[in-house]
Interface confidence: low
């Protein structure tokens, strides 16, 4: 942090504050922290800031801070103060910088505040402020930035803000707001910044953002809107635009038509039913699209014109198909998530060539072709767990040189095509019941995890044999680390001198590891030795019936016998 | 004097957690938000989230959305920094820093001394 | 987040003035005066030099000044000093994204 107070001797500064030149022939005073009750009096004429944060000044007189003409920074937060009279910044000309945030004001000094011409910033934040005089920033004209988030203003000072045209960035953020009426902000044409966050808004006038002209963000976030914010429409320099965690229940057509500029839209956390298809088009800037659980979709929205799109996530919703077109709209697609939908059949793929990452699990998914895949060079993940899957081409994953991670787990497959899938680290096919053939290791040289239907097919990764054995006991499932092991199997070496566990444990660990470097389930195991042998249920009953009547026939013999001697 | 005292440093798996705490000496804690910034060894600054205590909300960097939980306790003037899913790149040295001036834009005045975290198999 | 642009490394003998760039855009370092300086030496924690533009902290010496031009920050540094090498970062607010991005960092070497 900052370096101890010094107490610096100089001429005009109090005792205990730290005082040093500016550089400009002036003096920076720092007081804050020190308990103070009241203001210091032997300040320097030539005082530029004044840190007075932090103590227990409870009231101002008026002219407290006589002459401090040069005076451009001060702080007076975190204090006591309930109100500041009349005069007391009189004679502050020179004044940029002024900071109340963290006291117990409960309503804006407007008489304090008048013909502070020079000021830029104000801070009110975080005070009981519950009324805004409409007069009280008039004389405020060179007002930047405006803090009032964190009072108790339940709606907004329109008449205060129509003085305030140089205004940049103003946050109203964690009040008691509950309605934004037309023309809230007409006069703050400057402004770029309005946060709205964390207050009660559940109505917005028509035209409550109108005279916004240079607004670039607006953080809507944490209200209880139950309406898409059509007022939006005449941002036409909006960036970034925040309304997550509201109760809002559709996007209506055509949404953002007057947001072109519109980089970022945070809208989870609202419950989402029905989304216009035209509501996203033409957004050249858009980069990321999520919508999760909205219900009511039926269609793939129509993307025309928001073509620079590289993440779109649009799950839980009932999407039977998507148009053979979809990466004509979004050649710059990396990563598609439609899961949780209600998809049949699949376009070609092939002309989004920059996805990396596909999921499209818990679908209705029946058969893969050879170009639903093909020549995706750069595609990284595939989720297709969770369909109907009964038929794979035996080329749909020859051309994905970059595929890592192949999940089909829960499919109806009785075959899997292996060409093209030799650089695989992930492999999933676990829950497809008729798929009983072995696969052999040699085609999976960099797999690292394998997940299959039953555990004898496990065999051909070298988990078989003693290997199972090393494996049920030490690595009983993905999570359990050596810390759960050395508790659980300590025991075991109680001969071994207590200095040199750790490092046994440690290389008996590098010794697993090598023995078998591909992870695969379900393990085969004393009851699991060779499951493929008794496998499917009618073999099983099959095998338990020839047992019965053995045993039937053997008694019937035994009993013949016994009567025939 | 404000004082950021951290916990110390870690050793954790892949795909493991780790929480660090941040607590801090002054009785000004509420009013003050508390960020948490890391250094990866030989890299640059690199901000992660911050957390005002008084309401318990906290912002976060895009990049660690969803991995990272920052919570504060003002009983205790302590700030907690929770990542999840562990990678060996998150290996850092961990800072918690005060934004002097209360709000998420303002510098941070005083920080924490540094929590070394190292994750690896 | 983008990272803000400063030069990798600059370098000046004792005495002599030095200034470090920063490079955004007209969402963080062009909206506001929030841009920041610090300084950090081997080993410790940044240090707060230059706040909201040009402002200096208490205990931190008048031979560093800040100013902003536009789209870019410049840190100065006059009459270097050997206790001056280290590495400085620039940090401001970026309005899209409500979020905080730090220069990539610039290493100061005190020749001589």
């Known amino acids: 942090g900052s370096s101890p107070r010094s107490g610096v001797l100089l001429r005009g500064c109090p005792t205990h504050c730290h005082c040093e030149p500016d550089g400009r022939m002036l003096l920076r005073v720092d007081c804050s922290d020190l308990g103070l009750s009241e203001l210091p009096s032997n300040l320097s004429v030539f005082t530029s800031y004044l840190d007075l944060s932090m103590n227990n000044i409870s009231q101002l007189l008026p002219n407290p801070l006589p002459s401090l003409r040069f005076l451009e920074e001060l702080r007076l937060a975190g204090n006591a103060l309930t109100y500041i009279p009349k005069g007391a910044f009189t004679g502050l000309y020179s004044l940029k910088v002024l900071m109340l945030q963290n006291n117990q004001l409960r309503h804006v000094p407007t008489e304090a505040l008048q013909n502070l011409r020079s000021l830029q910033s104000l801070r009110l934040d975080a005070n009981h402020i519950s009324y805004v005089p409409p007069s009280c920033f008039s004389g405020l004209h060179s007002l930047r930035h405006l803090w009032l988030d964190d009072n108790a203003l339940t709606e907004i000072p329109v008449q205060a803000f129509r003085s305030l045209s140089a205004l940049q960035a103003m946050t109203l953020a964690l009040n008691k707001i509950h309605h934004i009426p037309d023309y809230a902000f007409g006069n703050l044409s400057s402004l770029v910044v309005l946060h709205l966050h964390n207050n009660r808004i559940h109505s917005l006038g028509k035209k409550c953002f109108d005279g916004l002209h240079s607004l670039e963000t607006l953080d809507l976030n944490y209200n209880n809107l139950d309406e898409f914010p059509t007022a939006i429409r005449t941002l036409s320099n909006l960036k970034e635009l925040g309304f997550h965690s509201n109760n809002i229940r559709s996007i209506p057509e055509k949404a953002f038509v007057g947001n072109p500029s519109l980089i970022t839209i945070h809208f989870y956390d609202n419950p989402i039913q029905f989304v216009g298809r035209s509501a996203f088009q033409h957004l050249p800037e858009l980069r990321t699209l999520t919508l999760n659980g909205a219900s009511q979709i039926t269609e793939f929205p129509d993307l025309t014109g928001t073509a620079n799109l590289e993440s779109l996530t649009l799950t839980g919703a009932q999407i039977s198909s998507l148009p053979q077109t979809v990466c004509n709209q979004l050649p710059n697609l990396q990563v598609l998530d439609l899961s949780y939908n209600l998809l049949e059949d699949l376009p070609s793929f092939s002309v989004c060539q920059k996805l990396q990452k596909i999921d499209l699990r818990h679908n209705e998914i029946y058969e893969i072709k050879v170009d639903t895949f093909q020549q995706l060079l750069s595609l990284r993940s595939l989720n297709l767990a969770w369909n109907k899957i009964a038929i794979i081409h035996p080329n749909a994953f020859s051309t994905l040189p970059s595929l890592i991670k192949l999940d089909l787990s829960s499919n109806l497959l009785s075959s899997f095509p292996i060409t093209g899938l030799h650089g695989l680290t992930h492999l999933k096919l676990t829950g497809n019941h008729a798929l009983q053939s072995l696969i052999s290791s040699e085609n999976f040289p960099e797999l690292k995890v394998i997940e299959m239907p039953y555990a004898y097919q496990c065999c051909a990764f070298g988990v078989c044999e003693n290997a199972y054995k090393i494996s049920n006991q030490w690595n009983k499932g993905d999570n359990s680390s050596m810390d759960d092991l050395h508790k659980k199997d300590a025991g075991m070496f109680q001969a071994q001198d207590e200095r040199d566990l750790e490092d046994f444990l440690l290389d008996f660990e590098e010794d697993l590891k090598a023995l078998h470097s591909v992870q695969c389930s379900p393990s085969p195991g004393p009851f699991k030795p060779c499951e493929h042998l008794l496998d499917g249920w009618l073999i099983r009953i099959g095998v338990m019936a020839l047992i019965v009547l053995g045993g039937v026939a053997g008694l019937l013999l035994f009993i013949g016998l016994g009567i025939f001697f | 004097q404000v004082q950021l005292v951290q916990s110390g440093a870690e050793v954790k798996k892949p795909g493991s957690s780790v929480k660090v705490s941040c607590k801090a000496s002054g009785r000004t804690f509420s009013n003050y938000a508390i960020g948490w910034v890391r250094q990866a060894p030989g890299q640059g600054l690199e901000w992660m989230g911050g957390i005002r205590p008084n309401f318990g909300w906290a912002k976060y960097a895009q990049k660690f959305q969803g991995r990272v939980t920052i919570t504060a306790d003002e009983s205790t003037s302590t700030a907690y920094m929770e990542l999840s899913s562990l990678r060996s790149e998150d290996t850092a040295v961990y800072y918690c820093a005060r934004y002097g001036q209360g709000h998420f834009p303002s510098a941070f005045d005083y920080w924490g001394q540094g929590t070394l975290v190292t994750v690896s198999s | 987040d983008i990272a803000l642009t400063q030069p990798a490394s600059v370098s000046g003998s004792p005495g002599q003035s030095i200034t470090i760039s920063c490079t955004g855009t007209n969402s963080d370092v062009g909206t506001y005066n929030y841009v920041h300086w610090y300084q950090q030496h081997p080993g410790k924690a940044p240090k707060l030099m230059i706040y909201d533009g040009s402002n200096r902290p208490s205990g931190v010496s008048n031979r560093f000044s800040g100013s902003k031009s536009g789209n870019t920050a410049s840190l100065t540094i006059s009459g270097l000093q050997a206790e001056d090498e280290a590495d400085y970062y620039c940090?401001?607010?970026?309005?899209?994204?409500?979020?905080?991005?730090f220069g990539g960092g610039t290493k100061l070497t005190v020749l001589g």
């Open positions: 940090q401001a607010y970026d309005s899209h994204s409500f979020n905080i991005v």
